[in-house]
């Protein structure tokens, strides 16, 4: 049994880093290997995440790690029973993929606005909480080329778009994800989408 | 060469104090964390106190937690070990030794701690 | 607190004899283990960590083998310098404890 594909690993900067590898053959990750991980400080304590499969020969292993700091770094150790396969180490704040963004809602009813709103996916006391911007994607439902980003560099988990901008009479659907600058992070993964019917009163002619 | 030296080990009664000294050099002292280590006379390997690199944060075990106190001066490059109201089960070769997170990388010579009446 | 036990607690050997010191842990370490050695009046010497890692400077006669619950460090040709007391330690679980050492005589 040997290792195709060493670990890679990414931070949510909260609770859980998230590990993906693959073997050479198919395997059984949950009952043949064993990731050990133990953060490098003072008197830590070594952990065993118990990895599920990812396809035939892939596995994934959702690391349980406590408030994560930037100083923070982890020996990574794979096993198969008594057999050392691989032996790295992980710095979660250099490899951080943020949460993504909850209960994306439409407002409809601001008069000729649309408000959009999320929730942040960080408590208030985590380091990422100010430090998240957006991109926001709109898209119609009828027409695959009615496809548009917002980007939102501000702190605020909300977007204004004039519902003009958009057409009328039809369906529409958004998604949010996030980034932090601060970290060089990856982009989150989209949130759940929401769908709305876009209306709004045209405006008279001027004659 | 990193080295370790002991000093204040002696006599004491039951109940009685001590302050034992650990004098560092050859790396960079606020850098490691430190530890005091004994070995009762015929016995094994047993840590009775870590301290951080910085000095914020302390450990002890059960057997010692209340009587026993680490701290450091970084400035000196100095470890010390306070001793409260010793008992006979605390004789022992107390060591000064520096922490590699989880093992103990080098060791002092050992000052000699007795208890008795 | 993990219990490590080291046997045999003493042996007698001879000059270029192979010798072999076992350590047993009462739970799982995988490798989070350690080695040391310790001359009479003398500091003691980390040799192993990580089970079989050697340190820098300890001669090449000295191995670490084992993983789980059952480890061992091998002389593979002792030496006059080698007759010492041998430890063992885990950093799997905090309390980091110590085995109860195996001395090394001359026979």
């Known amino acids: 049994m040997k290792v195709l594909q060493e670990p890679t690993c990414v931070s949510d900067y909260m609770s859980i880093s998230t590990c993906e590898w693959k073997m050479n053959g198919p395997t059984n990750c949950s009952t043949e290997l064993r990731l050990l991980y133990q953060l490098v400080f003072l008197l830590s304590e070594a952990h065993t995440c118990i990895p599920e499969n990812n396809g035939g020969a892939g596995c994934v292993c959702h690391l349980l790690m406590d408030d994560v700091v930037s100083a923070d770094n982890y020996t990574l150790d794979l096993w198969a029973g008594q057999q050392l396969l691989w032996k790295g180490s992980f710095k979660p704040s250099e490899h951080v993929k943020p949460r993504a963004p909850g209960n994306l809602t439409v407002h409809t009813n601001v008069s000729d606005t649309l408000l959009l709103t999320w929730s942040n996916p960080y408590p208030p006391d985590n380091y990422l909480y100010n430090h998240l911007t957006y991109a926001v994607n709109i898209w119609s439902e009828n027409d695959p080329a009615d496809f548009r980003i917002y980007n939102v560099t501000y702190l605020e988990p909300s977007l204004r778009i004039a519902a003009s901008t958009l057409k009328s009479g039809i369906s529409y659907r958004a998604r949010v994800r996030a980034w932090a600058q601060c970290y060089n992070t990856t982009w989150s993964e989209w949130s759940p989408s929401t769908k709305w019917h876009n209306s709004y009163r045209e405006p008279f002619e001027q004659h | 060469e990193v080295q370790l030296v002991e000093s204040g080990g002696g006599l004491v009664q039951p109940g009685g104090s001590l302050r034992l000294s650990c004098a560092a050099s050859g790396f960079t002292f606020s850098s490691y964390a430190m530890s005091w280590v004994r070995q009762a006379p015929g016995k094994g390997l047993e840590w009775v106190a870590i301290i951080s690199g910085g000095g914020d944060s302390t450990y002890y075990p059960d057997s010692v937690k209340g009587r026993f106190t680490i701290s450091r001066d970084n400035a000196k490059n100095s470890l010390y070990l306070q001793m409260n109201s010793l008992r006979a089960e605390d004789t022992a070769v107390y060591y000064c030794?520096?922490?590699?997170?989880?093992?103990?990388?080098?060791w002092g010579q050992g000052t000699t701690v007795t208890v008795s009446s | 607190d993990i219990q490590m036990t080291q046997s045999p607690s003493s042996l007698s050997a001879s000059v270029g004899d192979r010798v072999t010191i076992t350590c047993k842990a009462s739970e799982d370490l995988y490798n989070r283990l350690a080695w040391y050695q310790q001359k009479p009046g003398k500091a003691p010497k980390l040799l192993i960590s990580?089970?079989?890692s050697l340190e820098t400077g300890v001669p090449s006669r000295f191995s670490g083998s084992g993983s789980g619950r059952d480890f061992t460090l091998t002389i593979s040709s002792l030496q006059p310098e080698d007759f010492a007391t041998y430890y063992c330690?885990?950093?799997?679980?905090?309390?980091?404890?110590f085995g109860g050492g195996t001395k090394v005589e001359i026979k």
């Open positions: 330690q885990q950093y799997w679980r905090n309390p980091y404890t």
């Open positions: 030794a520096r922490l590699h997170y989880w093992y103990f990388d080098f």
């Open positions: 990580g089970a079989t």
